[in-house]
């Protein structure tokens, strides 16, 4: 039977009355244009909603905005447009919300053509009050907060100036001209690229990378011949033009650009690109585009220095620079990532890794599903997940895969079951074990969200017709109840719940459409009365993550340790609560070959745990460049996976010798780097 329709499904008692008492409608008395919504702070209940619309006049477009504020998770909204002097706010800059619980908000206003600079509205009290500030420049980008100090802001101007404020946008200072890209690093450091000649575009590949650690008092040039740069985890990356041709290579620094090493990655040509897919303090997933317009490349995983890379996955789907990739970090289980590969026959298949890129496999076929028309063998096929690429191709996929760190093991995604992704209308699948096993959860495309750390899953059918029904499940998607939240259906535009999945409130956004009127409306439903009681010890059960063979002593070992979690029983209908903390018990494992990646010059054949030499490097000395010195690598093909905590067991030999030879990577060597002060 279809999910949620068998006899085992126990109904939640009197849920209609309970939800009806906790359903709050708000009709916005202004009119439908565009709407953007931002949460201010964590667990504050404060939501800001900005509605903007353009009025087409004969010569120009006149804009109007309204700003609304809720402090009860969206149940009620107050029009606070007068706090921003009824000014038109530029939606392309969005609402710049400060980090953590700073309560800071910056809105960028539209100003008339002849003005000297832009205008911002600043709040540092969760949008209770705003201060208008006229800027000495016209902003090109949204204000960026320093992650360490929310009083420090940076912005680029339309004239490519880098502007910094040390008092939350009250006073601004231009610290550098001719800036292309600027980013905050750690410890209030700013990294930025500059051009010398014409423009950012003209000087691409001849840019300089600069650093300031004191908000513009002094500077250090930390790189030349730069194409672009990026930050990921504790790594600073720069793609650098080669001396002799138009190729470029990745260089990496772990000391804020003081010293650089050339990453052992293939160089790329003009039409190719590098992309940091994911990064943490241990390692990096790097995509390297294939030559030609193939739409795919190779994923490499780094060592703990970001220098030596192992091939992780071939034919990785990634369309173009800034294009689409399905690469997804499954945040509900350590070490799990999902992505798509482009097969030789141009079909797209989903792959999953449970060990941070060490090995990739297909997703197991859901037990309650049949193989579709793409399958050659009707009994053997796998689940294929729709993500960013499918959405970009306008397939009937309203949402990307969803997982939350505090909803352990849960992954929800649209998918199809066959030999490859299908263009047919997808269904929604759920995994409760981090992607090892899957079940069809809902028939057809849906919007979905996780509430109360997984205690409730909410879904709304994706339809072109107006809707008035929401579905919810209290047992991780096994059984579903439907609730009619309004008599008059609305054209649905989105689900909004507080980031972090700890809330029990969900807001359904849409608009009502009549011949004469089109208005935004939101319905906020609080599920607190559905989960009547707080969860107790008896409501939780012990679950071993990554368990595939309970008989095996090493069962559950991933990246050198196993973790047991306390997880809510599916049958328990209770509140995890806002203060819920995931309870886990780690234990160290013995080292096996699975705890090692293939070293530079080695690769792992499919379905084999042993690393073998790359044929093209057989018999060659393995030498690479490190901090401007040539190193010689003695290895039998393995290196410990970054972040792997295993002890004892297998211990392959690995030794790096300094060859005492200079090697340069056409990058500034440390001694050539210059500093200057303002």
């Amino acid at each position: 039977s279809a999910p949620g329709e068998d006899e085992e499904c126990g109904r939640v008692r009197d849920f209609v009355a309970k939800l009806a008492n906790n359903t709050h409608q708000h009709v916005f008395d202004d009119l439908r244009g565009s709407v953007s919504l931002s949460w201010v702070g964590d667990s504050t209940g404060v939501i800001l909603v900005l509605t903007t619309f353009h009025v087409p006049l004969v010569i120009m477009t006149f804009g109007q905005s309204k700003l609304y504020r809720s402090e009860d998770y969206g149940k009620n909204f107050k029009d606070i447009t007068d706090l921003i002097n009824n000014t038109f706010i530029r939606t392309e800059f969005g609402m710049a919300i400060g980090p953590e619980n700073s309560g800071k908000v910056v809105l960028t206003a539209e100003v008339s053509g002849g003005s000297r600079g832009g205008r911002i509205f600043r709040s540092s009290d969760f949008a209770k009050n705003f201060v208008q500030t006229d800027l000495p420049f016209h902003p090109l980008t949204q204000m960026m907060y320093s992650p360490q100090n929310s009083d420090y802001l940076l912005a680029l101007s339309t004239e490519n100036g880098l502007w910094v404020s040390k008092n939350f946008g009250g006073k601004w200072e231009e610290i550098h001209k001719a800036v292309c890209l600027a980013k905050w690093g750690s410890d209030n450091t700013i990294f930025f690229t500059t051009y010398a000649n014409g423009s950012c575009k003209a000087d691409l590949g001849a840019l300089e990378l600069w650093r300031t650690s004191d908000l513009g008092k002094s500077f250090k040039t930390i790189g030349v011949k730069i194409y672009s740069f990026g930050l990921g985890g504790r790594f600073l990356f720069a793609s650098v033009m080669a001396d002799k041709d138009t190729t470029r290579r990745i260089h990496v620094s772990t000391d804020q650009g003081d010293t650089w090493s050339m990453a052992q990655l293939p160089s790329v040509g003009q039409e190719q690109f590098y992309s940091i897919l994911a990064a943490n303090d241990d390692m990096v997933f790097m995509h390297v585009d294939e030559p030609g317009d193939t739409g795919f490349g190779t994923i490499f995983t780094s060592d703990d220095r970001g220098i030596v890379y192992s091939k992780s996955l071939d034919r990785h789907l990634y369309t173009t620079t800034g294009g689409e990739t399905d690469f997804t970090n499954v945040t509900s289980l350590r070490g799990v990532y999902i992505t798509s590969v482009l097969s030789e026959d141009n079909s797209i298949q989903t792959m999953i890794t449970f060990d941070q890129g060490g090995r990739w496999t297909h997703l197991r076929k859901p037990e309650n599903s049949e193989c579709d028309a793409t399958a050659k063998n009707k009994n053997e096929c796998s689940l294929h997940i729709h993500a960013s690429y499918s959405i970009s191709q306008k397939l009937n996929v309203p949402m990307a895969p969803l997982s939350e760190p505090n909803a352990v093991g849960i992954v929800i995604a649209h998918g199809s079951v066959g030999d490859a992704i299908s263009v047919m209308v997808p269904d929604v699948y759920i995994s409760d074990d981090g992607g090892y096993s899957w079940t069809k959860m809902l028939e057809g495309p849906h919007y979905y969200t996780i509430l109360d750390s997984g205690g409730i899953i909410v879904a709304i059918e994706h339809s072109s017709r107006p809707i008035n029904v929401i579905k919810f499940s209290t047992d991780e998607g096994q059984c579903w109840q439907t609730y009619t939240f309004t008599r008059d259906p609305i054209y649905f535009t989105g689900l909004a719940s507080e980031p972090g999945a700890r809330s029990m409130n969900i807001s359904i956004w849409g608009f009502t459409e009549s011949f004469l009127t089109s208005q935004w409306v939101s319905y906020t439903i609080d599920f607190k009365d559905i989960l009547e009681r707080n969860c107790e010890e008896k409501d939780y059960t012990i679950w071993l993550a990554h368990s595939t063979d309970p008989e095996d002593y090493e069962d559950g070992c991933i990246l050198g340790y196993k973790e047991q979690f306390l997880r809510l029983r599916k049958s328990s209908v209770c509140q995890n609560g806002r203060d819920y903390v995931v309870t886990k018990q780690p234990s160290i494992c013995l080292c096996s070959l699975e705890d090692f990646l293939c070293d530079f010059g080695y690769y792992r054949p499919e379905n084999d745990s042993k690393c073998v030499e790359q044929p093209e490097l057989k018999g060659h000395d393995l030498e690479f460049c490190l901090y401007g010195r040539e190193e010689h690598l003695t290895t039998n093909g393995y290196r410990k996976i970054p972040g792997d905590k295993c002890q004892g067991g297998v211990n392959p030999v690995r030794e790096v010798k300094d060859l005492k030879k200079k090697c340069t990577s056409n990058f500034l060597s440390p001694e050539k780097q210059n500093s200057k002060s303002n």
Epitope: D30, L31, R32, G33, S34, T51, T52, F53, H54, V55, P56, L57, Q64, E513, S514, F515, L516, T517, S518, Q519
Partner: antibody, heavy 124, light 106 residues
Framework: QVQLVQSGAEVKKPGSSVKVSCKAS????????ISWVRQAPGQGLEWMGG????????WYAQKFQGRVTITADESTSTAYMELSSLRSEDTAVYYC?????????????????WGQGTTVTVSS | DIQMTQSPSTLSASVGDRVTITCRAS??????LAWYQQKPGKAPKLLIY???SLESGVPSRFSGSGSGTEFTLTISSLQPDDFATYYC????????FGGGTKVEIK
């Protein structure tokens, strides 16, 4: 400048149908609603219904429900009004008009541009 | 449907007179009301929208006021070109017109 040009006069027999067209030029057709209004000889204005071309949905006055069909073809920027089961009391001048809406995109709230009118005579 | 009652149905006035036409809605329509002028054999012409906003190109002697259920169209100084029939129209739900007021020469 937006203009609405309607099809020519029609003489119809009772029980038959009439289809009047309204072609828009010089503006964004899909952004506005199109209303159909009729006026019997010596009588007042009567709203029949309307359509939002960009939305594809039509709305009808209760009196005409089931007898009138309003459609729009975005590719030709033309709206149509078809009235069936004609009776002698349907003899009137039929107007199309651009109808501003209370939404974020539009500023006009009245019928600011009208067609020249199409005379429909129902007679046996 | 919302009913619109216009009064008077006929009004005799002279050039230079101040003329007031009233429109009453059967329920509150906020400010969603428009006024039109129609001359024989011609299509109606929008004068006022949203109860009091003057349509561009319309002389300033025309003004509208009111909200909720009571609305007024005022011609401050009647001109020869103003002799016509005037209609109010609500735009809150589906559209309905008032019965019209004919302004004729006294």
């Amino acid at each position: 400048q937006v203009q609405l040009v309607q099809s020519g006069a029609e003489v119809k027999k009772p029980g038959s149908s009439v289809k009047v067209s309204c072609k828009a030029s010089g503006g964004t057709f899909r952004s506005y609603a199109i209303s159909w209004v009729r006026q019997a000889p010596g009588q007042g204005l009567e709203w029949m219904g309307g359509i939002i071309p960009g939305f594809g949905t039509a709305w009808y006055a209760q009196k005409f429900q089931g007898r009138v069909t309003i459609t729009a073809d975005e590719s030709t920027s033309t709206a149509y009004m078809e009235l069936s089961s004609l009776r002698s009391e349907d003899t009137a001048v039929y107007y199309c008009a651009r109808q501003g809406r209370k939404t974020g995109y539009y500023y006009y709230y009245g019928m600011d541009v009208w067609g020249q009118g199409t005379t429909v005579t129902v007679s046996s | 449907d919302i009913q619109m009652t216009q009064s008077p149905s006929t009004l005799s006035a002279s050039v230079g007179d101040r003329v007031t036409i009233t429109c009453r809605a059967s329920q509150s329509i906020s400010s969603w009301l428009a006024w039109y002028q129609q001359k024989p054999g011609k299509a109606p012409k929008l004068l006022i929208y949203k109860a009091s906003s003057l349509e561009s190109g319309v002389p300033s002697r025309f003004s509208g006021s009111g909200s909720g259920t009571e609305f007024t169209l005022t011609i401050s100084s009647l001109q020869p070109d103003d002799f016509a029939t005037y209609y109010c129209q609500q735009a809150d739900g589906h559209i309905t017109f008032g019965g019209g007021t004919k302004v004729e020469i006294k």
